[in-house]
C-alpha cells in the first residue's frame, strides 16, 4: 500500500527461559493466519477463477472486433488490464499463505506488485474513459459521427495506460525487500523512510487521480446520461438505472477501503496502534479492490441480458450471446440503449 506493506503472525510472548528454535514455530499461533488474511485468500481465489475465465472470454470476443468497433477497443483494454491483474494473484496469494513472507526476490518485489498496481489503475482510468465516451455519444452525437474513430479510441487508451504508469512509478521506485531478523522473514513493501511528505503526496495523488476523479467522472457522466434517457418517455428503463448504479457503486465500494486506509496510513506513524490495525487489514483491502477485476464480466452477463430465461443456458453460451450482441457489448459498460441506439447504427462500424 502506501506504507510498508506487511503484517506478521502473532508469535506470542517469547520467554527468555524458552528455547528459540527457529526450526519450529515459536508458538502454536505462528502457523495460524489472521481472519482478515483468510478472507483475503478466499476473495483472491474467487477473483482469480472468475476474473481469468471471464476476462479471457471478453478478450477473445472483443479482439476480433477491435479493428473496426470502438466499443470493442474499450472492452478489450479493460479486459486485458483486469486479466493481467488476475494473473498476478497467485503471487499475492502465496505471500499471504506464508504470513507475508516474500520468497520471490528483490526484482520481483519491485516489478510484480507494481504491475498489479499498473493494471488496476489502468482499469479505473479506462472505465472513466468509457464513461466519457458514453457521455459524448449521448450529448454530442454529431461530434461523434465526425471524430469518434478507432484511432482516437486507441489514443485515449494509451493516455489511460500512461497515466496508470505514472501512478505506479512511485511504488516501483520506493519498493524494497527487507529481511527481518526475528522472526526470520523477508518482506516486500514500500519504504519511504526519510520522506514522509513524499509518501503523503503519493497517497493524495493516488486518491485523487486513481479514485476521486474517475468516481466523479462516472457519477457525472451517468447522471447526465440517466437524466437524458429518462426524459424520453419511450426509452425509460429500470434496467439502465440498475446498471448505472451497479457500475458506480461497485467501483466506489470496492476501491474505497483501499484508498481510505492508504491515505490514513500515510499520515500515521508506523508504530501507532491505528497504523498497525490498518496494516493487518491491508491484504483484505487489496483483495476487496481486486473484486473490480472480475466484476465487469459479471455485470456484462447479469445486466446485459438479465436473469430471466438465461440461467438454463451454459455460461460460455450465455457470455457469447451477451458479448456478441451489438446493443450490449457495443454500448458501454452501462448498456444504455436509449438515445444512443439510433446513433450507434451510424457510428459503431467506424
Amino acid at each position: 500500500m502506501n506504507s510498508f506493506n506487511y503484517t506478521t503472525p502473532d508469535y506470542g510472548h517469547y520467554d527468555d527461559k524458552d528455547t528459540l528454535d527457529l526450526n519450529t514455530p515459536v508458538d502454536k499461533t505462528s502457523n495460524t493466519l489472521r481472519v482478515p488474511d483468510i478472507l483475503a485468500l478466499v476473495i483472491f481465489a474467487v477473483v482469480f477463477l472468475v476474473g481469468v475465465l471471464g476476462n479471457a472470454l471478453v478478450v477473445w470476443v472483443t479482439a476480433f472486433e477491435a479493428k473496426r468497433t470502438i466499443n470493442a477497443i474499450w472492452f478489450l483494454n479493460l479486459a486485458v488490464a483486469d486479466f493481467l491483474s488476475c494473473l498476478a494473484l497467485p503471487i499475492l496469494f502465496t505471500s499471504i499463505v506464508q504470513h507475508h513472507h516474500w520468497p520471490f526476490g528483490g526484482a520481483a518485489c519491485s516489478i510484480l506488485p507494481s504491475l498489479i498496481l499498473l493494471n488496476m489503475y489502468a482499469s479505473i482510468l479506462l472505465l472513466a474513459t468509457i464513461s466519457a465516451d458514453r457521455f459524448l455519444l449521448v450529448f454530442k452525437p454529431i461530434w461523434c459521427q465526425n471524430f469518434r474513430g478507432a484511432g482516437l479510441a486507441w489514443i485515449a487508451c494509451a493516455v489511460a495506460w500512461g497515466l496508470a504508469l505514472l501512478l505506479t512509478i512511485p511504488s516501483f521506485l520506493y519498493r524494497v525487500v527487507r529481511e527481518e531478523y526475528f522472526p526470520p522473514k523477508v518482506l516486500c513493501g514500500v519504504d519511504y523512510s526519510h520522506d514522509k511528505r513524499r509518501e503523503r503526496a503519493v497517497a493524495i495523488v493516488r486518491l485523487v487521480l486513481g479514485f476521486l476523479w474517475p468516481l466523479l467522472t462516472l457519477t457525472i457522466c451517468y447522471t447526465f446520461i440517466l437524466l437524458r434517457t429518462w426524459s424520453r418517455r419511450a426509452t425509460r428503463s429500470t434496467k439502465t438505472l440498475k446498471v448505472v448504479v451497479a457500475v458506480v457503486a461497485s467501483f466506489f465500494i470496492f476501491w474505497l477501503p483501499y484508498q481510505v486506509t492508504g491515505i490514513m496510513m500515510s499520515f500515521l506513524e508506523p508504530s501507532s496502534p491505528t497504523f498497525l490495525l490498518l496494516n493487518k487489514l491491508d491484504s483484505l483491502c487489496v483483495s476487496f479492490a481486486y473484486i473490480n477485476c472480475c466484476i465487469n464480466p459479471i455485470i456484462y452477463v447479469v445486466a446485459g441480458q438479465g436473469f430471466q430465461g438465461r440461467l438454463r443456458k451454459s455460461l460460455p453460451s450465455l457470455l457469447r450471446n451477451v458479448l456478441t450482441e451489438e446493443s450490449v457489448v457495443r454500448e458501454s459498460k452501462s448498456f444504455t440503449r436509449s438515445t444512443v441506439d439510433t446513433m450507434a447504427q451510424k457510428t459503431q462500424a467506424v
Partner: antibody, heavy 121, light 112 residues
Framework: QVQLQQSGAELAKPGASVKLSCKAS????????IHWVKQRPGQGLEWIGY????????KYNQKFKDKATLTADKSSSTAFMQLSSLTYEDSAVYYC??????????????WGQGTTLTVSS | DVVMTQTPLSLPVSLGDQASISCRSS???????????LQWYLQKPGQSPKLLIY???NRFSGVPDRFSGSGSGTEFTLKIRRVEAEDLGVFLC?????????FGAGTKLELK
C-alpha cells in the same frame, strides 16, 4: 552470574584458519542465541552472525558467509567461530554476545571480553 | 544493508553538562510487529560494549535514569542529563530490526 569467557589472543598467518571459542556459564546455554561481532582497531562494530545452540541453526551476514563458520557444543556450553582463508583485514577483536529480550532475542545483554586476532606473516 | 549514521563523531563535554547524540538509519527500523529495535551501547576504553537503552527508550537494568532515549522511524537521540566521569567512552547505536544487524560508527564522549 552470567559470563562469556573467550579464548586468548591469536596470531595467525595469511591463508590460515583459526577457531575462536566462547564458554558460557551462569545460565542454560541452549536457551539463548550466541552472536559474534567484529571490531577492527579504531572502527565500528560489524555483526558476523548467530547460532541457536539448541538446534544448531545459524544465520550469517552475507559479508561473512564464506569467512566464518559458527558451531556450538552443548555438552561443554561452548560456542565456536572458525575463520578461514585469513587476510590482514581479519585482524580485529572478536566478541561473542548473548541475546535477550521480552518478545524476542533483540538485545545484546552480555558480552565476552573479546579475542584479539592478529594476522601477520 | 541499513546504514547507521551517528553525529557527532566526537562530543567534548564538561562534567555535569547535558549531552545529546543523534543516530539516523537509512531505512525505517519499525518492525512488522510495530516495535522499533534500536539500542544504545556504551563502550569504555579496553572494555566490551554495555547495553544502556533498548527499543528506542527503555533503560536496561542497572542503567541510571540520567540516560534517556527517544525517536522513531529513522531518527533517534540519546540524551545524558548530567554527564559523570563514568559516562566517558564511545556510545554506539545499533539496530536489530533487519538483517544484517548493524551498528553506528560511534560517538566519543570526552572531557573538554
Amino acid at each position: 552470574q552470567v559470563q562469556l569467557q573467550q579464548s586468548g589472543a591469536e596470531l595467525a598467518k595469511p591463508g590460515a584458519s583459526v577457531k575462536l571459542s566462547c564458554k558460557a556459564s551462569g545460565y542454560t546455554f541452549s536457551s539463548y542465541w550466541i552472536h559474534w561481532v567484529k571490531q577492527r582497531p579504531g572502527q565500528g562494530l560489524e555483526w558476523i552472525g548467530y547460532i541457536n545452540p539448541r538446534g544448531d541453526y545459524t544465520k550469517y551476514n552475507q559479508k561473512f558467509k564464506d569467512k566464518a563458520t559458527l558451531t556450538a557444543d552443548k555438552s561443554s556450553s561452548t560456542a565456536f567461530m572458525q575463520l578461514s582463508s585469513l587476510t590482514y583485514e581479519d585482524s580485529a577483536v572478536y566478541y561473542c554476545v548473548r541475546v535477550t529480550g521480552s518478545e524476542g532475542p533483540y538485545y545484546f545483554d552480555y558480552w565476552g571480553q573479546g579475542t584479539t586476532l592478529t594476522v601477520s606473516s | 544493508d541499513v546504514v547507521m549514521t551517528q553525529t557527532p563523531l566526537s562530543l567534548p563535554v564538561s562534567l555535569g553538562d547535558q549531552a545529546s547524540i543523534s543516530c539516523r538509519s537509512s531505512q525505517s527500523l519499525v518492525h512488522s510487529n510495530g516495535n522499533t529495535y534500536l539500542q544504545w551501547y556504551l563502550q569504555k576504553p579496553g572494555q566490551s560494549p554495555k547495553l544502556l537503552i533498548y527499543k528506542v527508550s527503555n533503560r536496561f537494568s542497572g542503567v541510571p535514569d540520567r540516560f534517556s532515549g527517544s525517536g522513531s522511524g529513522t531518527e533517534f537521540t540519546l540524551k545524558i542529563r548530567r554527564v559523570e566521569a563514568e559516562d566517558l567512552g564511545v556510545f554506539l547505536c545499533s539496530q536489530s530490526t533487519l538483517v544484517p544487524l548493524t551498528f553506528g560508527a560511534g560517538t566519543k564522549l570526552e572531557l573538554k
